[in-house]
């Protein structure tokens, strides 16, 4: 469900959702819109200033690192 998350609670949420992948506060370049002029939206804009669906949090997780080959 939609929820408002700010400050330490937002960090706790991102840490738990993303786990060992880590996270970004702003979506990495190349996410979503291809327009270079489009303002970069961040998790604070999406989930603190407004309420966001919990699934949005996953959008800010870093990509899974490929397993290292021996």
């Amino acid at each position: 469900g939609p929820e408002t998350l700010c400050g330490a609670e937002l960090v706790d949420a991102l840490q738990f959702v993303c786990g060992d992948r880590g996270f970004y506060f702003n979506k990495p370049t190349g996410y979503g819109s291809s327009s270079r002029r489009a303002p970069q939206t961040g998790i604070v804009d999406e989930c603190c200033f407004r309420s966001c669906d919990l699934r949005r949090l996953e959008m800010y997780c870093a990509p899974l690192k490929p397993a290292k080959s021996a």
Epitope: E9, Q15, F16, V17, L54, R55
Partner: antibody, heavy 121, light 109 residues
Framework: QVQLVQSGVEVKKPGASVKVPCKAS????????MHWVRQAPGQGLEWMGI????????SYAQKFQGRVTMTRDTSTSTVYMELSSLRSEDTAVYYC??????????????WGQGTTVTVSS | DIQMTQSPATLSLSPGERATLSCRAS??????LAWYQQKPGQPPRLLVS???NRATGIPARFSGSGSGTDFKLTINSLEPEDSAVYYC???????????FGGGTKVEIK
């Protein structure tokens, strides 16, 4: 169908560790969080902690901090709960329980059948 | 940490009667509360989520109500198979966590 399968019985000596598995099937393993809850004989339910099978992150009850470790193996859809420095008071039934966290609904909707851990010298 | 207190500890009623079980949180938990039924030798079964939403397959005689700090589980027209221990559980969002109440034992005379 959706199910969580746990091992049956574990007998351990005081000071030892126990690692309890919980194998999930019938759903997407990484889409649901997993709790561990224990119940001592004749007592109520006690929450121990939770693991996110996708990222591997954990949150533990303060009482168990430093003694409990929850891990997962996504290749076998199994979560594990390891409890160290066992004492007689840890004798209990240990349950894993699924949480449909992303739906926003509160509640553990699927439970394992429980693993009985007996700590005795 | 939030404490959950259930009352009464035991409730002894006859078939067909109404059971009202209470659960009180030490601080406001909104509607982040679930109820479970547990019979001897079995794992708990989810009855109600979000304080008032009956879980899949749960008979309509079970209903949950309340928000904030005071919650109730009502069992209308008790049946012999409702003899069990009932637990409430609060959910903390971030980092995720949970607390159970001490339970209410419902006995059918």
């Amino acid at each position: 169908q959706v199910q969580l399968v746990q091992s049956g019985v574990e007998v351990k000596k005081p000071g030892a560790s126990v690692k309890v598995p919980c194998k999930a099937s019938g759903y997407t393993f990484t889409s649901y969080y997993m709790h561990w809850v224990r119940q001592a004989p004749g007592q109520g339910l006690e929450w121990m902690g939770i693991i996110n099978p996708s990222g591997g992150s954990t949150s533990y009850a303060q009482k168990f901090q430093g003694r409990v470790t929850m891990t997962r193996d996504t290749s076998t859809s199994t979560v594990y709960m390891e409890l160290s420095s066992l004492r007689s008071e840890d004798t209990a039934v240990y349950y894993c329980a699924r949480d449909d966290f992303w739906s926003g609904a509160v509640g553990m909707d699927v439970w394992g059948q429980g693993t009985t851990v007996t700590v005795s010298s | 940490d939030i404490q959950m207190t259930q009352s009464p500890a035991t409730l002894s009623l006859s078939p067909g009667e109404r059971a009202t079980l209470s659960c009180r949180a030490s601080q406001d938990v909104g509607s982040d509360l679930a109820w479970y039924q547990q019979k001897p030798g079995q794992p708990p079964r989810l009855l109600v989520s979000d304080a008032s939403n009956r879980a899949t397959g749960i008979p309509a005689r079970f209903s949950g109500s309340g928000s904030g700090t005071d919650f109730k589980l009502t069992i209308n027209s008790l049946e012999p198979e409702d003899s069990a221990v009932y637990y409430c559980q609060q959910r903390r969002r971030w980092p995720p966590g949970a607390t159970f109440g001490g339970g209410t034992k419902v006995e059918i005379k």
